[in-house]
């Protein structure tokens, strides 16, 4: 028996369902009573879901997995993973045994988009050219860790005096806080871009300082 899986990682958004595709080619006369199908974590071999001795033996993984029982006889051994969590990320092995056996691994990459950044300024009044200000760009509930870029109004990257911290919450999602310390010119726009490297999703935030008062551009 030959097992086939997708070579590319399966990308799944947090809280959505994902399908880990796996298939085999049944011989003529194949019956499910002959099938041993086991999904397991590749690294540890912890059972995820199994179908053996003609029976679906259920989810051994947070009760969030299911097979496609009506499609098994056609050689579809795919696994449905419901309400994906950050902790589900990793490699899963599809093991199929009929008379001989084969197995293949599928990678699951979990992702969550970052929120539109919120911008704060400190100090936020009585600003004069030459003052040192701290601009904070905050974006929430993303995964995996973000890449953060700062630019000025002319699109020139600002790399000095930037401090970025990323903290995971109890669900494993990251909150990003990036701080730019800059000396004010007569006026200027400062923008931050928070990029999710898996989703290739960019979230933008900017602040424009025009002497007095401080203005935030309207959201797009």
């Amino acid at each position: 028996v030959e097992v086939q899986v997708s070579e590319d990682p399966v990308v799944a958004l947090v809280d959505t369902d994902a399908t880990l595709r796996c298939s085999f080619s049944p011989e003529p006369g194949f019956s499910l009573a002959q099938l041993n199908l086991i999904w397991q974590l590749t690294d540890t071999k912890q059972l995820v879901h199994s179908f053996t001795e003609g029976r679906d033996q259920g989810s051994a993984y947070s009760n969030r997995t299911a097979l496609f029982p009506d499609l098994l006889v056609q050689g579809n051994a795919s696994l449905r993973l419901q309400r994906v969590r950050v902790t589900d990320e990793g490699s899963y092995t599809c093991f199929v045994s009929i008379q001989d056996f084969d197995s293949a691994a599928v990678s699951l990459q979990v992702a969550a988009p970052y929120s539109k950044p919120s911008m704060t300024l400190e100090p936020n009044k009585d600003l004069r050219p030459g003052n040192m200000v701290t601009i904070t760009c905050s974006s929430y509930q993303g995964y995996p860790e973000a890449e953060v870029f700062w630019k000025d109004g002319q699109g020139v990257p600002l790399t000095g005096n930037v401090t970025t911290s990323q903290m995971a919450n109890e669900r494993g999602l990251f909150d990003v806080h990036s701080v730019l310390r800059v000396v004010l010119g007569a006026n200027g726009t400062y923008s931050c871009l928070v990029r999710n490297p898996v989703l290739q999703q960019d979230a933008h935030g900017s602040v424009t300082i025009t002497g007095q008062p401080l203005t935030f551009p309207p959201e797009a």
Partner: antibody, heavy 117, light 106 residues
């Protein structure tokens, strides 16, 4: 016919580890789940965990997860259950049992483990 | 975990009696399995898939039920039947057993 023959009785000290074996014969060892079940003196049955010899997939009862390791040796058709950090409450008969559909249809004769200082 | 509660825990009856014991699950299960255990011996599978007799088991044993309520019935008790009976489920992990029903001679 299906036979599961377990290793002999053990007396071990608290804190130690023990490894119980279960040699299978009379069927294709790699095709069926092998389970381990505990029965304390005068008590009921408690599932410890299981392993599929062919893929090596395993699943443990959370109550035993930190202290149990179930393994197989396909070349000798033998399953093993190792229990660590033993305490007096682990004194029990331990059974290996082969799956039959969603049941445990064939059982070993049991191994008595006594944990005593 | 799915809890299985067997009732009664002890059952007194006489040879030739018809007896029924119950296994109640804390959540719905697809199938129930029944085992017989004699003192000092390994459990023996009696009933699989709720109502099917395991190989070599006398026809006086029968099982029924669905959802959360399952029963094992022995139609005419024989002297060798006065032992302990356990139910078991594999609808979800961990696999669980009932606490047992001990059948005693009245």
């Amino acid at each position: 016919q299906v036979q599961l023959v377990q290793s002999g009785a053990e007396v071990v000290k608290p804190g130690a580890s023990v490894k119980v074996s279960c040699k299978a014969s009379g069927y294709t060892f790699t095709n069926y789940w092998m389970h381990w079940v505990k029965q304390a003196p005068g008590q009921g049955l408690e599932w410890i965990g299981m392993i599929h010899p062919n893929s090596g997939a395993f699943n443990y009862n959370e109550r035993f997860k930190t202290r149990v390791t179930i393994t197989v040796d396909k070349s000798t058709s033998t399953a093993y259950m190792e229990l660590s950090s033993l305490r007096s409450e682990d004194t029990a008969v331990y059974y290996c049992a082969r799956s039959t559909a969603l049941a445990t249809g064939y059982w070993g004769q049991g191994t008595l483990l006594t944990v005593s200082s | 975990d799915i809890q299985l509660t067997q009732s009664p825990s002890f059952l007194s009856a006489s040879v030739g009696d018809r007896v029924t014991m119950t296994c109640s699950a804390s959540s719905s299960v697809s199938y129930m399995y029944w085992y017989q255990q004699k003192p000092g011996k390994s459990p023996k599978l009696l009933i699989y898939d709720t109502s099917n007799l395991a190989s070599g088991v006398p026809s006086r044993f029968s099982g029924s039920g669905s959802g959360t309520e399952y029963t094992l019935t022995i139609s005419s008790l024989q002297p060798e039947d006065f032992v302990t009976y356990y139910c078991q489920q594999w609808s979800s992990y961990p696999l669980t057993f009932g606490q047992g029903t001990k059948l005693e001679i009245k």
